[in-house]
């Protein structure tokens, strides 16, 4: 068995309800998507070996799938992929690789080939532990790969300040496939914003640790750069969660209240 | 230059605390994280804990229950706090510094701690 | 959570090539970086390696660092192996804490 969940069930049911869903979202003139020869371009993977899958094999998927990214919307992220998703809010705030096509008919699932037969295999999935060059990290370096050259203005990048490996992962996605791709000429600046868990440890913020590695390897690369902790519009949506928290007293609020009374 | 040196006593007695200072120098304790590291003698490296930049603390599962790791910013020191010493616990104790938390750029020069009585 | 094993001692002689090797029992490095220290006797550990095959400056360029994907092994490469290279060499990783390998004794003939 391999370490990965198996196939998610009804893979093809939910790739293809989900691309005709998405279509309602993308403007007039990109609405002419075929989810149909979508999904048979991505169907391509699994006919491979679980680790013999390259993210060059998605690329007519990719091909047929993608679209533009409005300016200014686009939302990186590590270790937050919930929070982002909850943020975004189908593509109304921002568009994550989450909410660009190619991205949303895979969110969450997970998908290979038997080893040895041709069927999908239910039962388990290569991850990166197993072999490299399996089927989901290759969509999602191919994916990666595409979301940021089509990237452009103000890059937004939500980190997670309380993961224990530091904020900024040195080997992930954001690292390995990401940062390498944004098309300077098309980006004004880039903002990261730095969230901790409500209650969770305080392992980073910005100009710490790993933050400090992430600064300079982007300005570097001649980005402009600026990091916001706790950015508050995504720390009032954490805190919808935990009202009752210290970390998500309205002082201002509170004050504002007194001032009046 | 960067520097950290760690200080404590070198003989503490079985079931006593110990408590170990790393001073540090040339960085800020809230730009880089810090761990403590123990070498007993002839033998490997054990990772014990980290304080991360936050503040926030992690520790080795097997020393958690009695291994506490804080810190003073404005005095740029990191202390270790474990109690109920055994002899295996006979090592030279070493604070590292990291940019990550996920390897060690800088290490301190260690100080030698035996337990007996 | 995963060993590192590393062998005990390796022997070779002076101005040839030698590979220490760091074998993860499960899984591989494909999400973490391996990185390697130098520890001379009565000294502490020095960074050699760091994020698989990085060398930080003022450590010499016959020093390189390498992931194997067959053996599923780090390897620390030391070319033209000097006198003062005979050390014990640490490989190191993470997962949800800090790992280190038993280290290995390099002896110079």
């Known amino acids: 068995r391999w370490r990965g969940e198996g196939t998610s069930a009804h893979l093809r049911d939910i790739f293809l309800g989900r691309c005709a869903e998405y279509r309602a979202l993308l403007s007039p003139e990109q609405r002419n998507k075929n989810c149909t020869a979508i999904w048979e371009a991505f169907k391509v993977a699994l006919d491979k070996d679980p680790c013999s899958v390259l993210p060059s094999d998605y690329d007519l998927f990719i091909n047929l799938s993608r679209h533009s990214i409005p300016r200014d919307k686009s939302l990186f992220w590590e270790n937050s992929h919930l929070l982002v998703n909850s943020f975004a809010d189908n593509t109304r705030r921002f568009m994550p690789l989450s909410d660009v096509l190619y991205g949303r008919v895979a969110d969450f699932l997970s998908w290979c080939r038997q080893k040895n037969d041709s069927g999908l295999d239910y039962q388990s999935c290569p991850t990166s532990e197993d072999c490299e060059n399996n089927p989901v990290d290759s969509f999602w370096k191919r994916a990666s790969i595409q979301y940021s050259k089509d990237s452009s203005g103000v890059i937004h990048v939500m980190l997670n300040g309380s993961e224990p490996t530091g904020a900024y992962p040195i080997k992930g996605f954001f690292a390995d496939y990401e940062i390498p791709n944004l098309q300077k000429e098309k980006i004004t600046r880039i903002e990261i914003w730095v969230m901790h868990e409500i209650g969770g440890p305080n392992v980073e913020s910005c100009g710490e640790g790993s933050m400090k590695v992430l600064e300079k390897r982007l300005k570097d690369m001649g980005f402009q750069y600026s990091c916001i902790n706790d950015y508050r519009p995504v720390k009032l949506l954490q805190c919808v969660d935990h009202s009752t928290h210290p970390d998500c007293a309205l002082k201002s609020a509170a004050a504002a209240t007194q001032r009046k009374a | 230059q960067v520097q950290l040196k760690e200080s404590g006593p070198g003989l503490v007695q079985p079931s006593q605390t110990l408590s170990l200072t790393c001073t540090v120098s040339?960085?800020?304790?809230?730009?880089?994280?810090v761990s403590w590291v123990r070498q007993p003698p002839g033998k490997g490296l054990e990772w014990m804990g980290i304080i991360w930049t936050g503040g926030s603390t992690a520790y080795n599962s097997l020393l958690k229950s009695r291994l506490s790791i804080s810190r003073d910013t404005s005095k740029s020191q990191v202390f270790l706090k474990m109690n109920s010493l055994q002899t295996e616990d006979t090592a030279t104790y070493y604070c590292a510094r990291s940019i990550t938390p996920t390897f060690f750029d800088y290490w301190g020069q260690g100080v030698m701690v035996t337990v007996s009585s | 959570q995963f060993v590192l094993t590393q062998p005990n001692s390796v022997s070779t002689n002076l101005g040839s090539t030698v590979k220490l090797s760091c074998k993860r029992s499960t899984g591989n490095f494909g999400s973490n970086y391996v990185n390697w220290y130098q520890q001379h006797e009565g000294r502490s550990p020095t960074t050699m390696i760091y994020?698989?095959?990085?060398?930080p400056d003022g450590v010499p360029d016959r020093f390189s660092g390498s992931i194997d994907r067959s053996s599923n092994s780090a390897l620390l490469t030391i070319n033209n192996v000097q006198t003062e290279d005979e050390a014990d060499y640490f490989c190191?990783?993470?997962?949800?804490?800090?790992?280190f390998g038993g280290g290995t004794k390099l002896t110079v003939l």
């Open positions: 994020r698989d095959d990085k060398r």
């Open positions: 190191q990783s993470y997962s949800s804490g800090i790992v």
């Open positions: 040339g960085f800020s304790l809230t730009s880089y994280h």
